[in-house]
């Protein structure tokens, strides 16, 4: 469910949303590190109805979210990272 | 005291529609995501929808999907079930339910239920 | 789709004494399981939620535990009040429930 992604593209997100919403509705998470041509973190949430939102990363439970899935990943599996270069 | 009152329940033949409401109270609706739930004629508990609480996001399971549209009116306190294209297998007992709160960020689940609104589908 | 397999469906137990249920997930759901007592005529309660976090209001007599994919959820002290329909549901990945357990006064 968590993914990062490095991207040398602009920002994704226009606009960020710090709706909360619970992890049985979320498909996947997408988070872009700042830097290259991005002054800012981004995540994207894919939900389970299809739509995709970008979350302000500084909103207390997606902080809350990731802390948990770094947790357990490192405790079992590792985290899927895709790393994407554009030149 | 928080209350769920559902209504419009009924004998609608199969292909025919139905809209049930659900009248909230002793608590701030707009504050809370909120679902359907049914209970077939084998006791058994199935979810149907559930809309965010303010009302941009549902979300359905693939059988009820495409039938059945989940809405609300936080000025009025009431949540909606459209349900459409009704099937033998949709006859239940329908349930409302609140679900989490929209400003938290806690897992909880469904926490208060109605006393539920009867559906038959037949010929 | 995640399938919640309860145990046993039906029981019966004298007064004062205790009852476990069981309900296993076909995948791990991450201790997001919750329990519902269902009488005839009303809603379901919500006993417990994320495993073993009683709501409020709920005797301690009821409780539960469990990881991964199995959990279980115990009522000891039987009190004639108890005597219902009990459900789990996993809110991990959307919802299912599992497929009840009645339990009745011996």
């Known amino acids: 469910v968590l993914e990062v992604y490095y991207t040398s593209l602009r920002c994704r997100c226009v606009q960020e949303s710090s709706v909360f919403i619970p992890r049985r509705f979320i498909d996947r998470i997408q988070i872009l590190p700042r830097g290259n041509g991005c002054p800012r973190k981004e995540i994207i949430v894919w939900k389970k109805n299809k739509s995709i939102v970008c979350v302000d990363p500084q909103a207390e439970w997606i902080q809350r979210m990731m802390e948990v899935l770094r947790k357990r990943s490192s405790s079992t599996l590792p985290v899927p990272v895709f790393k994407r270069k554009i030149p | 005291e928080v209350q769920l009152v559902e209504s419009g329940g009924g004998l609608v033949k199969p292909g025919g529609s139905l809209k049930l409401s659900c009248a909230a109270s002793?608590?701030?609706?707009?504050?809370?995501?909120m679902s359907w739930v049914r209970q077939t004629p084998e006791k058994r508990l199935e979810w149907v929808a559930t809309i965010s609480d303010g009302g941009s996001d549902a979300y359905y399971p693939d059988n009820v999907k495409g039938r059945f549209t989940i809405s609300r009116d936080n000025a009025k306190n009431n949540l909606y079930l459209q349900m459409s294209h009704l099937k033998s297998e949709d006859t239940a007992m329908y349930y409302c339910a609140r679900d989490y709160y929209g400003s938290g960020y806690e897992d909880s689940p469904m926490d208060y239920w109605g006393q539920g609104t009867s559906v038959t589908v037949s010929s | 789709d995640i399938q919640m397999t309860q145990s046993p469906s039906s029981l019966s137990a004298s007064l004062g004494g205790k009852v476990t249920i069981t309900c296993k997930a076909s995948q791990d759901i991450n201790k997001y399981i919750a329990w519902y007592q269902h009488k005839p005529g009303k809603g379901p309660r919500l006993l417990i939620h994320y495993t073993s976090t009683l709501q409020p209001g709920i005797p301690s007599r009821f409780s539960g535990s469990g990881s991964g994919r199995d959990y279980s959820f115990s009522i000891s002290n039987l009190e004639p009040e108890d005597f219902a329909t009990y459900y789990c549901l996993q809110y991990d990945n959307l919802y299912t429930f599992g497929g009840g357990t009645k339990l009745e006064i011996k």
């Open positions: 002793g608590f701030t609706f707009s504050s809370y995501a």
